[in-house]
């Protein structure tokens, strides 16, 4: 069905009109405007940008644009007492100190308020001790150290390379291992692509470049002092000792020049295998401590950052729906950056700005979407998804009743190779159909569809002729909408070739070198990839807001549920004897999935046949589609993670960025062979199978005929 049927307007106001209005040149202009000074959360500069965006969205034609403010816990370095790491000799003299700031990029030497590299929410402290190299500080790395190598990290300062998993998980793992401090560094193996020059001559990380970032383990809580509730004027705040997710040991990030000085002296054990070696000219010995002549030297951290309750500002724009104003399609991305935000977030914010402009242009010509579209410029994403989470907490009752979909809009690019999409299975068909209608921006695919280049470059591992679409994890502002509230969500951006580029993220991520010039010179000079991302994100919002029948296909959920059930069953079957001993059966889950599949199939048949001119029946069918994602929410949440309530998906307990399927069962099975009470452990597996089976069955029943 063409989208313009939603409202009785002239056919020129269809998806094509919206897409044709999007211009690469505008995105470029907006990106430049958003990246000239830092916009750190909680600063005056970011407040001014919020007001600018509010003003411009009003000019673009939105019905209303409001600022929503909250007072949340943020973290900043001490301006007069900088953070650094030293090597000290036996007399306590500092014989080496890490750098206090990144050398500024050309043209930015006189910019003030560049926050030096720091790990947000690190406690203060000056621990000193022997160093242990812990690879990526993943769960499996600590297993290797503790169980295989019998190396004890207790009382040690650990040094871990960035990459593979969210930095907060690294810090949590180090804490659990008994470490008294954590040094994070960027290894060239992960942040320096072969054959590319360092910034400013290329897009690689120079030796003095450092990745900033928060090190929280919030598990979806939002502001650490007001979990579950908005940090408003009358909020009751927890004491800092009861705050959610704060690290308990000092943490600090460094670049690879400084890391070289620490790692080159390492003694103790050799690295266990090649996967522990990076690209520096050092032995990558694990330690503990330094070798030979340096064995009396220690490492000392000097961390003086402070946590402060600070005001943040979201910008919320509304384009009222003509037919179903009480149904919300949300497009949101953050505005706050660590420094200039050339990619993260402003490549995304510039795209949102252009999407708002295009929708506003159509609205000025008399068009309205069928459903209400909300646009959001979130604050304090970098400090733990705080702006989006506080707003969703404040509006949770409206959102759970009215929220149709949430489309995320952080960085538009992390490479320029092909499209990358993570979304709910409900959106698979929407994404497929949309990308078949869009032109590919890729070289060698002139005149071909985006779907074709995407499928060629990033094929689905399961279905030939289809592109890969990944599970939603976290680490971005969709988290509260999807994982807590159960609102169908999706995200899209242009990415690198994961097969040839093994580095983690993009090299200059969260460094001072993430500038406008980085994007304009090296990633997307013509802004054609930005435009394509704008078309995908905007096109998804357009269809979700304007199609008569919601563009969700519940049959795709049935397919993945079977895949996830097979996967978790095969993990459990690695313990056949215990499954027999403790009578562990997956029959209930497979039965529920089978029922879901049958009911989804029948629902889809009814969806083809019902009378779409009957507004009551139309609304009823659409509500069943809208509330399907909601049906996967367990009000009690996952064990020890009350704000992760989706039974089918949650961020991995070992990597916030990654999504895990049937997370309750997965976590119950994880490392089960090491549990001291096997009977209790397998009992929890059985309970989680029960919860999953019940939830799938209950969700299936929401798709049954209502009477």
């Amino acid at each position: 069905k063409s989208s313009n049927e939603a409202t009785n307007i002239t056919p020129k106001h269809n998806m094509k009109a919206f897409l044709d209005e999007l211009k690469a040149e505008n995105i470029k202009k907006f990106l430049y405007n958003f990246t000239q000074i830092p916009h750190l959360a909680g600063t005056e500069q970011n407040f001014q940008l919020a007001k600018q965006i509010q003003s411009q969205w009003k000019e673009f034609g939105l019905d209303s644009v409001e600022l929503a403010h909250y007072d949340v816990l943020l973290s900043y370095p001490n301006k007069t007492h900088p953070n650094y790491i030293s090597i000290i000799n036996e007399d306590g003299n500092e014989i080496f100190n890490t750098s206090l700031f990144e050398p500024p990029p050309p043209g930015y030497e006189n910019v003030s308020d560049i926050v030096p590299p720091f790990s947000a929410f690190s406690p203060q402290g000056m621990p000193e001790g022997d160093l242990v190299y812990v690879n990526y500080a993943r769960t499996e790395d600590f297993f290797k150290l503790e169980r295989d190598m019998k190396i004890n990290c207790s009382g040690k300062i650990v040094i871990a390379r960035y990459g593979k998993v969210f930095r907060g998980n690294k810090v949590k793992n180090a804490q659990l291992a008994g470490a008294k401090g954590v040094i994070l560094y960027s290894d060239p193996a992960d942040y320096f692509a072969p054959g590319v020059k360092s910034y400013p001559d290329g897009w690689n990380l120079p030796g003095g470049g450092v990745q900033r970032g928060n090190i929280l383990n919030l598990n979806g809580a939002g502001d650490p002092l007001t979990p579950g509730y908005p940090a408003n004027e009358y909020a009751y705040r927890r004491g800092i000792a009861e705050a959610v997710g704060l690290p308990s040991i000092p943490v600090h990030p460094i670049g690879y020049y400084d890391a070289q000085k620490l790692l080159e002296k390492m003694g103790g054990s050799a690295p266990p295998d090649s996967s522990w070696r990076g690209s520096l000219k050092v032995p990558y010995n694990v330690g503990p401590g330094f070798t030979g002549n340096f064995s009396t030297q220690k490492v000392k951290m000097h961390i003086h950052s402070t946590n402060e309750v600070t005001r943040i500002y979201n910008v919320i724009g509304t384009l009222r729906g003509a037919v179903e104003p009480d149904r919300y399609v949300i497009l949101g991305g953050h505005r706050d950056s660590w420094v200039f935000g050339g990619i993260d977030p402003q490549s995304g914010a510039a795209v949102v700005h252009e999407i708002v402009r295009s929708f506003g242009t159509l609205k000025k010509e008399g068009w309205r979407p069928r459903r209400t579209i909300l646009f959001a410029s979130w604050d304090a994403e970098e400090f733990g998804l705080l702006g989006s989470t506080e707003w969703a907490e404040e509006n949770s009752r409206l959102l759970q009743e009215r929220g149709v979909a949430y489309i995320n809009a952080d960085s538009s690019i992390e490479g320029n190779y092909t499209l990358r999409v993570d979304c709910t299975p409900l959106m698979y068909s929407l994404v497929h159909n949309l990308t078949k209608e869009l032109k590919s921006p890729d070289e060698g695919f002139e005149g071909k569809s985006l779907y074709e280049s995407w499928t060629k470059k990033s094929p689905s591992p399961e279905f030939s002729g289809m592109p890969r679409i990944s599970k939603l994890g976290s680490g971005n502002d969709f988290e509260v909408f999807f994982q807590r509230l159960g609102i169908a969500s999706g995200r899209a951006r242009y990415t690198k070739n994961w097969e040839t580029n093994k580095f983690s993220g993009y090299p200059l991520y969260h460094s001072v070198y993430e500038t406008y010039e980085l994007v304009e010179k090296f990633y997307d000079p013509m802004f054609k990839y930005h435009l394509t991302v704008a078309q995908v994100r905007g096109g998804m919002v357009f269809e979700l807001a304007n199609s008569i029948v919601l563009p969700f296909d519940c049959r795709d959920y049935a397919v993945v549920l079977r895949k996830y059930a097979d996967k978790i069953y095969s993990i459990s079957m690695k313990h056949p004897q215990e499954m027999k001993t403790y009578s562990v059966s997956f029959d209930s889950l497979f039965s529920a999935v089978k029922n879901f599949t049958e009911i989804a199939s029948k629902f889809s048949e009814r969806l083809q046949d019902f009378d779409k001119s009957n507004p009551i029946v139309l609304r009823m069918m659409n509500d069943q589609l809208m509330f399907l994602e909601r049906a996967f929410i367990d009000p009690l949440g996952l064990p020890d993670r009350p704000f992760y309530r989706h039974v089918i998906y949650a961020p991995s307990s070992h990597n916030k960025y990654a999504g895990e399927s049937f997370p309750g069962i997965y976590d119950a099975l994880f490392d089960i062979e090491s549990k001291v009470d096997p009977s209790k452990a397998w009992g929890e597996v059985k309970r989680q199978i029960y919860v999953a089976a019940f939830t799938v069955q209950a969700a299936a029943e929401t798709l049954s005929e209502v009477a």
Partner: antibody, heavy 115, light 107 residues
């Protein structure tokens, strides 16, 4: 109880290859490094290389100049060591050992290289 | 490569007496040294790891000590079942290397 059971003795001609298997049980296979060590008759021990069964990361003794390949099959908790371009001085007992500190050893596999 | 030099080549000690085995590394290896026992026609067995920690089930008459370049394995009261060849090994740098072994016999 941790057990490492190796494949049986082999007699090979010079220039041939040999592949020795090491089937493990009694522990989580992916958690422990697997090393391969050989011992020529009446001689000391010589480390050949190792593998991390979790991710396949390997390190080899450069003395073997690319002649040795260590692999694992996670589905059967089995490690393999293949030595190519055999010569008479490769005649030895070949051991697998589990654990970074060579905590548990297989019973050994005698490989005889003779024309 | 790091060379591990063991001394003596062989050692004859009376039952119940102390046996002291030495191992010297050609460069500093910290405490990254393990000791193994190999009885005739058997596989080696881990005795001591990280220079001084006894492996599970190893009798407390076996003690490891040392750091840097000089390491010692002491059997405080030799038993008949301790007759074997003892190897030291460094795990500080690749390739991992073993000493030539010390043969312990009953006097």
């Amino acid at each position: 109880e941790v057990q490492l059971v190796q494949s049986g003795a082999e007699v090979k001609k010079p220039g041939a290859s040999v592949k020795v298997s090491c089937k493990t049980s009694g522990y989580t296979f992916t958690e422990y490094t697997i090393h391969w060590v050989r011992q020529a008759p009446g001689q000391s021990l010589e480390w050949m290389g190792n593998i991390n069964p979790n991710n396949g990361g390997t390190t080899y003794n450069q003395k073997f100049q690319g002649r040795v390949t260590i692999t694992v099959d996670k589905s059967t908790s089995t490690a393999y060591m293949e030595l190519s371009s055999l010569r008479s001085e490769d005649t030895a007992v070949y051991y697998c050992a589990a654990g970074w500190n060579f905590d548990y050893w297989g019973q050994g596999t005698l490989v005889t290289v003779s024309s | 490569d790091i060379v591990m030099t063991q001394s003596p080549d062989s050692l004859a000690v009376s039952l119940g007496e102390r046996a002291t085995l030495s191992c010297r590394a050609s460069q500093d290896v910290g405490t990254a040294v393990d000791w193994y026992q190999q009885k005739p026609d058997q596989s080696p067995k881990l005795l001591i790891y990280w220079a001084s920690t006894r492996h599970t089930g190893v009798p407390d008459r076996f003690t490891g000590s040392g750091s840097g370049t000089d390491f010692t394995l002491t059997i405080s009261s030799l038993q008949a079942e301790d007759v074997a060849v003892y190897f030291c090994q460094q795990l500080n740098s690749y390739p991992l290397t073993f000493g030539a072994g010390t043969k312990v016999e009953i006097k």
